[in-house]
């Protein structure tokens, strides 16, 4: 399903035609809107008796929920109306139309204030946790563009000082669950995620507790994308690694691109003692190079039996017709000198070139500094 099919309708009723059977239409409505779902009979024939279902349960008509054979209206929608809706034939239960509905607030960005809401002595002898800034917790839905930084905050107090933990979609959420990692700032009662991507969408719950009680708050994160968009990268942590001579090292990079990206692992190198070419751009060697047909690619560079010469800066780079994204990784190798130094295993190794975007291909043999285009992606003739 293309990313362009999602619609956002705020502040007015919107009628949406039903998708083909088997497809799921993803729809976003603003809080307070009238959600209107339309499911015309397939092929224009008679519809027969139908039933509308939300999250597996039949919808009961009310003053707010208006049910017809081909149309469902939910007036004054709220977050609780989000879910999976389907229109089914009453007798066979065959799904005629299927919709995924999200009811959101207007897009907003995270609270970016630092250094506030630190744990403070409230003077209370003992007590269960409570929110110290409940007015700052009204934004329960955060809709941010991809690649932005998101911060969720749950400023609280209690005696003894409560602990805070985080859940994603009801499960414990730790840094290793997300390729770019997370930052937990306990003093600020916050969770920070940098460079958000579509897989970060979900419900984030802070759980604040001490021996006298527990309170929790759930935020919903929606990551908004434009289609097409420049590749988005999440670099696996740690970005800087120190390895012992002879050990194995792996760098990890996640690439999101809705337009076939050309993905490369590169390493900065020296040529004749120089790190940059005559035009000032760095020399790099292509370690791996390929085109990804998927929207989401988990790419890894494995360096086996590392030697001192493997130390240095590595780049994960993704290019599509809109633009380029890249992340740098540093490797330091220490220990006794290896008897024999091994080269990196690579799909396509050995091309050294100067230039931020230079890939040596048939078109580039003239020596001009050229950009990667989709044509370059099709044939890699490295020299």
């Amino acid at each position: 399903e293309s990313l362009g099919t999602e619609q956002r309708v705020v502040g007015r009723a919107a009628e949406v035609p039903g998708p083909e059977p088997g497809q799921q239409e993803q729809l976003v409505f603003g809080s307070g809107d009238a959600v209107e779902l339309s499911c015309p009979p397939p092929g224009g024939g008679p519809m027969g008796p139908t039933v509308w279902v939300k999250d597996g349960t039949g919808l009961v008509p009310s003053e707010r929920v208006l049910v017809g054979p081909q149309r469902l209206q939910v007036l004054n929608a709220s977050h609780e109306d989000s879910g999976a809706y389907s229109c089914r034939q009453r007798l066979t239960q065959r799904v005629l139309c299927h919709f995924s509905v999200r009811v959101t607030d207007a897009p907003s960005s995270g609270d970016d204030e630092d250094g506030e809401d630190e744990a403070e002595d409230t003077g209370v002898d003992t007590g269960a946790p409570y929110w110290t800034r409940p007015e700052r917790m009204d934004k329960k839905l955060l809709a941010v563009p991809a690649a932005n930084t998101v911060r969720f905050r749950c400023p609280a107090a209690g005696n003894p000082t409560p602990s805070i933990s985080w859940l994603k979609n009801g499960r414990e959420f730790r840094g290793e669950h997300r390729i770019g990692g997370i930052k937990l700032r306990h003093q600020q009662w916050s969770l920070v995620m940098e460079s958000v991507v579509p897989s970060d969408r979900g419900n984030y719950t802070c759980v604040v507790e001490n021996k006298f009680g527990s309170i929790r708050q759930t935020y919903t994160l929606d990551v908004l994308e434009r289609s097409p968009h420049r590749p988005i990268l999440q670099a696996g942590l740690p970005a800087n690694q120190t390895a012992v001579l002879g050990s194995d090292v792996e760098f990890h990079c996640k690439v999101y691109s809705d337009a076939q990206p050309h993905i490369q692992w590169l390493k900065h190198v020296e040529v004749n003692g120089s790190k940059v070419g005559p035009d000032g751009t760095p020399y790099v060697t292509v370690l791996k190079s390929w085109i990804s047909e998927s929207v989401e690619a988990d790419v890894r560079l494995r360096l086996a039996n590392v030697s001192e010469r493997d130390g240095g800066e590595y780049l994960c780079r993704a290019t599509n017709f809109i633009g380029v994204a890249e992340k740098a990784f540093w490797l330091s190798v220490h220990g006794p000198r290896a008897a024999e130094e091994e080269l990196v295993e690579a799909d396509e190794a050995g091309s050294v070139y100067a230039g931020e975007q230079k890939l040596i291909s048939e078109e580039d043999l003239g020596g001009e500094q050229k950009l990667i285009s989709e044509e370059d992606l099709h044939h890699h003739h490295h020299h």
Partner: antibody, heavy 115, light 108 residues
């Protein structure tokens, strides 16, 4: 929302150099590809070339000997120069975001080559 | 260079009908590097489809793209009055990136 605006003279004499500038607003010019495309009087579209924010370029081979695309990231602008123009270069010139396929376009500027 | 041929040159249909626009390339285009644009009079083209079948943001779902190799299709499932304009296909797999000559969609 990204917006692109072409600027430059609407009339150029034969054999002279056509110069246009595209100003990008709403986003940084960095890390993106930027193109020039023209639409000839018969309505056919022709890709002229593109530039990356680093300054690397690629041109249409049919125009390569006459075309130069440059970029000024400090001003969020990129430019087109087409030398030795003839009446056949009369067209609406568009600047756009993207290397090949493009998602944002300027509104276009008509350049007439005439003495 | 790769030549793109669009057919028909002009397509006459009524609102509510289904439109099928064809684009053939003189050489196979790998990885579906084909885009479709819509151009209204006096305006710049607007990207509808890229990657042969991906809809750009804000494009109604009545527009869909399909095809691979040398044969590509833009389908408009239910024509609206504002859809009666010119459509171009473009290949961006091989430089120079080239466009078709356009298909004009007119009201019958």
């Amino acid at each position: 929302q990204v917006q692109l605006q072409e600027s430059g003279p609407g009339l150029v004499k034969p054999s002279e150099t056509l110069s246009l500038t595209c100003t990008v607003s709403g986003d940084s010019i960095n890390s993106y590809f930027w193109s020039w495309i023209r639409q000839l009087p018969g309505k056919e579209l022709e890709w002229i070339g593109h530039i990356y924010s680093s300054g690397s370029t690629r041109y249409n081979p049919s125009l390569q000997s006459r075309v130069t695309i440059s970029i000024d990231t400090s001003k969020n602008q990129f430019s087109l120069k087409l030398s030795s123009v003839t009446a056949a270069d009369t067209a609406v010139y568009y600047c756009a975001r993207g290397a090949s396929a493009v998602d944002y376009w300027g509104q276009g500027t008509l350049v007439t080559v005439s003495s | 260079e790769i030549v793109l041929t669009q057919s028909p040159g002009t397509l006459s249909l009524s609102p509510g009908e289904r439109a099928t626009l064809s684009c053939r390339t003189s050489q196979s285009i790998s990885s579906g590097y084909l885009a479709w644009y819509q151009q209204k009079p006096g305006q710049a083209p607007r990207l509808l489809i890229y990657g042969a079948s991906r809809r750009a943001t804000g494009i109604p779902d009545r527009f869909s793209g399909s095809g691979s190799g040398t044969d590509f299709t833009l389908t408009i499932s239910r024509l609206e009055p504002e859809d009666f304009v010119v459509y171009y296909c473009q290949q961006y797999g091989s430089s120079p990136y080239t466009f078709g000559q356009g298909t004009k969609l007119e009201i019958k």
